[in-house]
Amino acid sequence: VPEKSVRWCAVSEHEATKCQSFRDHMKSVLPSNGPSVACVKKASHLDCIRAIAANEADAVTLDAGLVYDAYLAPNNLKPVVAEFYGSKEDPQTFYYAVAVVKKDSDFQMNQLRGRKSCHTGLGRSAGWNIPIGLLYCDLPEPRKPLEKAVANFFSGSCVPCADGTDFPQLCQLCPGCGCSTLNQYFSYSGAFKCLKDGAGDVAFVKHSTIFENLANKADRDQYELLCLDNTRKSVDEYKDCHLARVPSHTVVARSVGGKEDLIWELLNQAQEHFGKDKSKEFQLFSSPHGKDLLFKDSAHGFLKVPPRMDAKMYLGYEYITAIRNLREGTCPEAPTDECKPVKWCALSHHERLKCDEWSVNSAGKIECESAETTEDCIAKIMNGEADAMSLDGGFVYIAGMCGLVPVLAENYNTPNPNCENTAEEGYFAVAVVKSSSDLTWDNLKGKKSCHTAVGRTAGWNIPMGLLYSKINHCRFDEFFSEGCAPGSEKNSSLCKLCMGPSPNLCEPNNKEGYYGYTGAFRCLVEKGDVAFVKHQTVPQNTGGKNPDAWAKNLKEEDYELLCLDGSRKSVQEPANCHLARAPNHAVVARKDKADCVQTLLLDQQRMFGSSVTDCSSNFCLFESKTKDLLFRDDTVCLAKLHDRNTYEKYLGEEYVKAVTNLRKCSTSPLLEACTF
């Protein structure tokens, strides 16, 4: 059956031979209606990439550099399956490119000019492409030929395989730049030895190199890693201090109609039958015909790449930046230490309009990027298409797991002028019901629920976390008879109450009328039995404070809070009747942009913050007629975080633990991708 056939692309006679053997052996173990292998031979990996894009083949395994080529238009391929190394219990699908230095030296990443450098080899990922790609815009002009620019940047180097005649400085630390192990400073161990011997000041290697060469922790403690934010960390903190995370070897397919489920079914079956130590007659991860045919010999198996993970996310911002710099050879005109405009991520067209107005008022210091969901915005910030946005705590958690950092907190209670330097404790997550109902926390089963959105703090993580510990399962759509929880599966009962309009029904953005705090409260007013919101929601939308037709006649006394002890209290008593304390919303950004974002936002709020009194004829950053666009409308200021500058420290141990527990019930494709 052609649609059940995976056409594997082979790039040599030896690979084609192994592919045919793979095909024949898979035929013998798979049912006739299962996936099958067909072999397509091409002259090179680039030809394979083009063949897959043109639907003449379906899959090929590529190194990271080629995954980048495969992702570029017009190829538009995506990673679907990753090889892993090490054990099944602790599978490694990535390695980290790092810059290692001796602890007793005193320079940072931005002070490498004039130092002596040790590289694994010319054109190699960790030893050359990544460090030189990231340093590219700091190299002296002209930057071509690249070797000459690098020779003029460092005061001396060992770059195995470089041309010692044309670029003698690149071979200063290893005369001749030998391209094999005859050169004592060749490859990973060699580059590290170059540093260890004192020949060089910095070695560009992979994270495992130090551990492979220094078994003794005391010896390893004599070295540190240089981080991109111009700090240093110990060698075992490579996950938080690296130049780039590099995927090892990856199967790619078309982004649309790419047969990724079929490819996974095939490879999963293949590793069961012909993986490490599985079969004598055919081995997936070795071959009598040559080394690394179709797959790496060192691979131990395959892992399915999460569907939300596109090539940009898979390769990572740093890796793509490095490779793009090298390939395109373009650098910004502005010096790299100058803050470029900050690209704010706006959700759907409502936020985009407010962002546009901000952009005009900021004279272009703010630019705008749009996405349809918060998770899409976070992904855009990760890959550099956007720089920052303000997020509810639940999404601060996801953003943190995806490598972003909190930059400033929204403050709601502290009056100026102390606001900017005050760390507030947070707001209360509450359950609101109509005063006329007889509901309590203990009899919510079968009732109609209203949520701000799936994954948000007050609307989801806190109430559903509490509910989970009571019911011990994730079928929340069965607990409530129906509800509106934007971001739920469209056919779920938790989308039934949503108002839309269609096609935006149940979408987690302002196009869905019941989205957010105000939306969830509106859902309660019009259709629901209980709304999970922040403690300020009822006062902010009653007594004529919200002029919209549905809200203008509402009275605060017609609503009450549910307390966890089964009692109810007035909406004026959230301190004594709440579900939990929630961390304030916070602005997040990539680490490399955090300082810029903070500086610019503090400047912007001085001009457009809560000191502006007339928002009808002036732009106000924290105002959008109860719609909480870009920021919560009740924000007084954006406040510095001081030492709460990681998502764990910002959210607090208790909240992180609660959300981590709820991950069993996670419907977040982004979180799945970021924890791959």
Epitope: H350, L353, K354, E357, A363, S617, F619, E623, S624, K627
Partner: nanobody, 117 residues
């Protein structure tokens, strides 16, 4: 509520110029930001240029150096002077004053600009 009406569109050759006007009924003196947007067939509506009451302006990268936004508060009008027009500038152009605070429908009829030889 302020009512806005766009005019001045038309057919123009590549390299040519046009000036769009947006007249407000009601006083635009109380309005802070005015902006021109455009929407090409099958594309999202995008910000072209904006101007604040104090005269701060901002332009989309694709029109910088070719388009100029200005406003005349006495005439309750905002203008978009478009020079060196390109085929990719073809779109319906709308003006807005943001007074509806972003979430009600704020678009008038717009004015069609077609750049073609």
């Amino acid at each position: 509520q302020v009512k806005l009406e766009e005019s001045g569109g038309g057919l123009v050759q590549p390299g040519g110029s046009l000036t769009l006007s947006c007249a407000a009924s009601g006083s635009i003196f109380s309005i802070n930001t005015m902006a021109w947007y455009r929407q090409a067939p099958g594309k999202q509506r995008e910000l072209v240029a904006g101007i604040t009451r104090s005269g701060t302006t901002n332009y989309a990268g694709s029109v910088k150096g070719r388009f100029t936004i200005s406003r005349d508060n006495a005439k309750n009008t905002v203008y978009l002077q478009m020079n060196s027009l390109k085929p990719e500038d073809t779109a319906v152009y709308y003006c807005t004053d943001y007074s509806r605070k972003y979430y009600e429908d704020q678009w008038g009829q717009g004015t069609q600009v077609t750049v073609s030889s």
